[in-house]
Amino acid sequence: IVLRPSRVHNSEENTMRALTLKDILNGTFSYKTFFPNWISGQEYLHQSADNNIVLYNIETGQSYTILSNRTMKSVNASNYGLSPDRQFVYLESDYSKLWRYSYTATYYIYDLSNGEFVRGNELPRPIQYLCWSPVGSKLAYVYQNNIYLKQRPGDPPFQITFNGRENKIFNGIPDWVYEEEMLATKYALWWSPNGKFLAYAEFNDTDIPVIAYSYYGDEQYPRTINIPYPKAGAKNPVVRIFIIDTTYPAYVGPQEVPVPAMIASSDYYFSWLTWVTDERVCLQWLKRVQNVSVLSICDFREDWQTWDCPKTQEHIEESRTGWAGGFFVSTPVFSYDAISYYKIFSDKDGYKHIHYIKDTVENAIQITSGKWEAINIFRVTQDSLFYSSNEFEEYPGRRNIYRISIGSYPPSKKCVTCHLRKERCQYYTASFSDYAKYYALVCYGPGIPISTLHDGRTDQEIKILEENKELENALKNIQLPKEEIKKLEVDEITLWYKMILPPQFDRSKKYPLLIQVYGGPCSQSVRSVFAVNWISYLASKEGMVIALVDGRGTAFQGDKLLYAVYRKLGVYEVEDQITAVRKFIEMGFIDEKRIAIWGWSYGGYVSSLALASGTGLFKCGIAVAPVSSWEYYASVYTERFMGLPTKDDNLEHYKNSTVMARAEYFRNVDYLLIHGTADDNVHFQNSAQIAKALVNAQVDFQAMWYSDQNHGLSGLSTNHLYTHMTHFLKQCFSLSD
C-alpha cells in the first residue's frame, strides 16, 4: 500500500527538487500539533504565535487574551499554568533541563484579578516541580528535594518534608531510575480530586551505587557528575508513599500508606498512584521480579486519620509468559461508582484488551476482544468509554479512536476516526475536555498532520485547530520518497515492515538498502505516521531504500510476539532483522553488496549484534549510544525483560548477549561507533567496552564521541552526527559526494 501517492506529473518534474541534508538539519519540514489546554467542559487556553495566552470558549465562539505577551516577556516566561479558581497564573522561566522529563525553573505568580505579580513570600529558586491544586489555588512545590505547600500564592509556605537531600532522599520527585523507567514523569506527588489531600513518594537512594562520569565544560578541571543509578542486580531505591491533609497539614502530618504484604515480602517497586475520590486512593505495586503487580485500593479512616488498604481491595495481575503489562503496567480508569474500574491487560488469547473489574480480577468482564490490541483508555464518562486501538483493517501500526457506549446494553462500539480523513489520517491521539463535552483529535499521519476539534456527543467536527498549511505548501516542490507498509510471513511469525523508496523507484533496478532498527521490547517502529527526516533525505536525494522492521519483542500484536524475547534479549530481535533482509533481497531490487544497518540506543545494540552475526549480509553499520552489555543498564528496565544477573537466575544469558563477546565478528564489516560522553542513560562505558574489545581483538573500526552530550546528542552535535553518518554511508555504498 503506497501511503504517500506521488503528486508528480511529468510537466512538473523539472521544478521538483530532492530533499537535502540541510532541509533535515534546519527542521524545514517540521509539523505543528495543537493540544488544547482544557480548563472546563467548553473552554481551553492556547499560547498564540505572538505569545499571548488566549482563552477560547467553544460554545460562545469567543476568544480573548487573559495574559499578554508583555507580561510573559517581563519575566522571560516560556510556560504557564492557570489556577483552577482562575485567579492566578504561574509563569515558568529559566528552564534548565536535568534528565528526560525533569528540569528546574524559576516561577512567578501573576494575579489576574489585580493585574500584577504576587509580591511577598515569593517562591524560592530553582524549583524542581510546582503544581496547582485541582480546585482553588493551593500550590505544592518541590525545592531541594523537599515538598512545600502554600494555601494561597501570597502565603508563607508550609514545609511538609525535611529529610530531602541531593542524591540521597527525593520527596515528591523521582530519582533517576524511577523517572526514566517507571513513572515517566518529573513529579512524584498527586493531589486528591478536590485538593483535600496530597500524596507523595519518598525515594531513598542512600545505598544505590553511583555512576560517575566527567563533564568537561570549559574549566581547567572537569566536573564529575554523580548519579545514584542501579544497574541490573544492584541495590534499588527504597520507596514509601505518604499522604498529608492539606487543609490542616500540621495536625497529624504525613501518613504512610501500607504496602500489600505479598509485595513487601521482597524487593518491590511502586508503579503509579490514582486518586478515586478525596478519601479513596489506588496504588499500584510491582515485585522486583516484574511478573506480579498488585493494585491496592485504600480508604481514609477519619477516626484514626490513617489510610486503610484492605486485602479484599487488592487486585493481582500476573504474567506466566513474560512480564506484567506492556512497557509499563497499565493504570486503572475508575467509573462513577468509585470502586469499579476499566483496565487494559492480556486476555486468555494473549492480546491486551480493556477489562471491567467490579469485584475481582478473576471475574473481570472483557470489554474489547480480537486479534488486535487496545492501547489507551482516554476517558470514561457516565455513558461512554473512549479508547484507542489498532483494530481497523488489521494494521498494527495504526491508531484509531473508538467510543463504546457503556450506558446502554449491550454496549455498542463506534470508530470515531476510521473514516474521517482515511488516506491522510490513520494514527490518532485525542485530548478530552471535562465530561468529554468536546475533544481534540491530533492526527500524526501518514499524511501531513492535522488537529481538529469535535463535539463529544455527536463526534461532529467543529473546526480545524492546525492543518500545517505552510508545510503543505513547502512540500509542493519536494520529491518525497514513497512509503509502503506491508508484512512478511515467516515461520508463523508476522514481520511488519515499512519501506521508504526513492521518488523515481524502479523495481527493475538495484538499490542500496539501509535498515533502521530500534527493536526494544514493547516498541513499535512501523507506524503510519508522517515524517520528513534523515532517512527521507537518504531515499530522496541519495537513492537508498530504507526499511524498518518490527520483529519479535515488539508491541501491539499480541503476547506471543511481545514475550518471545523474555529472558533472551539480543537473539530474536537480531534474527528477525536478518530474516527480513533476506526477504528484501528476494524482492529483486536490492543490491546485496550494499546493505547497511543503523540504530540508536537499543537499536545500536541490535545493529551491533546484526553486524557481528557472521551472516555476511551487511557491508557496514552504525551504532549510536548502544547498550553493549545488559549488566551496564538500569535495573528496572533490564530485569523486567532479563531477570537477574545471578548464577541461579539468568547470568549466563547476560554474559552471552554482550556485543563484546562478538568482537571477532566485526572484522569483515565497516563499523561506526558513536556515543556522548555525558550520557546519563546508556553510559559511555557501554561504547568504551566495545572499543576496548575491538582493540583487543585487533579489529579496525571507526568511532566518534560527542563531548558533554547526553543520550539525545542534541544541538550542534545533531548536525555533526548526521553529516558524519551520511559521509560514512555514502562511502560504504560508493555514492559520490
Partner: nanobody
Framework: QVQLQESGGGLVQAGGSLRLSCAAS????????MGWYRQAPGKRRELVAF???????YYTDSVKGRFTISTENDKNTVYLQMNSLKPEDTAVYYC???????????WGQGTQVTVSS
C-alpha cells in the same frame, strides 16, 4: 468589548441577605464564564464565584454554602445571592469575565456591600 454594570449593594446586618445584579451589554451566553469579584479596603481584589455557560459553578471557600451565583440569559444578567452575610464580606463587589480579559474590557464601578455587626 463588554460593558458591565453592577447593582444591588447596600448596608445590611450580619446574618442578613443581599442579591447583587450585573447587567451586561450583550448576552451572558456570548460572553462566556462570568465571575463576581470583591475588594475589601486595603486588600487585593479576589474572585468570589464564577459560572460557566453550562452552569458549572465555583465558589471560594469562605463563601461556600452562603453565596449562589446564577444567570438569566434572556436578561443578560448575572446574579450573586448572598445569605448569612458576615462583617468580613464587606467590600466593593464587581462582576467580570473569569478570568478577566486584557483585551480592553474595563472593570465597572462596582457595588458597595457593607455588613455591620
Amino acid at each position: 468589548q463588554v460593558q458591565l454594570q453592577e447593582s444591588g449593594g447596600g448596608l445590611v446586618q450580619a446574618g442578613g441577605s443581599l442579591r447583587l445584579s450585573c447587567a451586561a451589554s450583550r448576552s451572558i451566553f456570548s460572553i462566556g464564564t462570568m465571575g463576581w469579584y470583591r475588594q475589601a479596603p486595603g486588600k487585593r481584589r479576589e474572585l468570589v464565584a464564577f459560572i460557566t455557560v453550562d452552569h458549572n459553578t465555583y465558589y471560594t471557600d469562605s463563601v461556600k454554602g452562603r453565596f449562589t451565583i446564577s444567570t438569566e440569559n434572556d436578561k443578560n444578567t448575572v446574579y450573586l445571592q448572598m445569605n448569612s452575610l458576615k462583617p468580613e464580606d464587606t467590600a466593593v463587589y464587581y462582576c467580570n469575565r473569569a478570568p478577566p480579559s486584557t483585551d480592553g474590557d474595563r472593570w465597572g464601578q462596582g457595588t458597595q456591600v457593607t455588613v455591620s455587626s
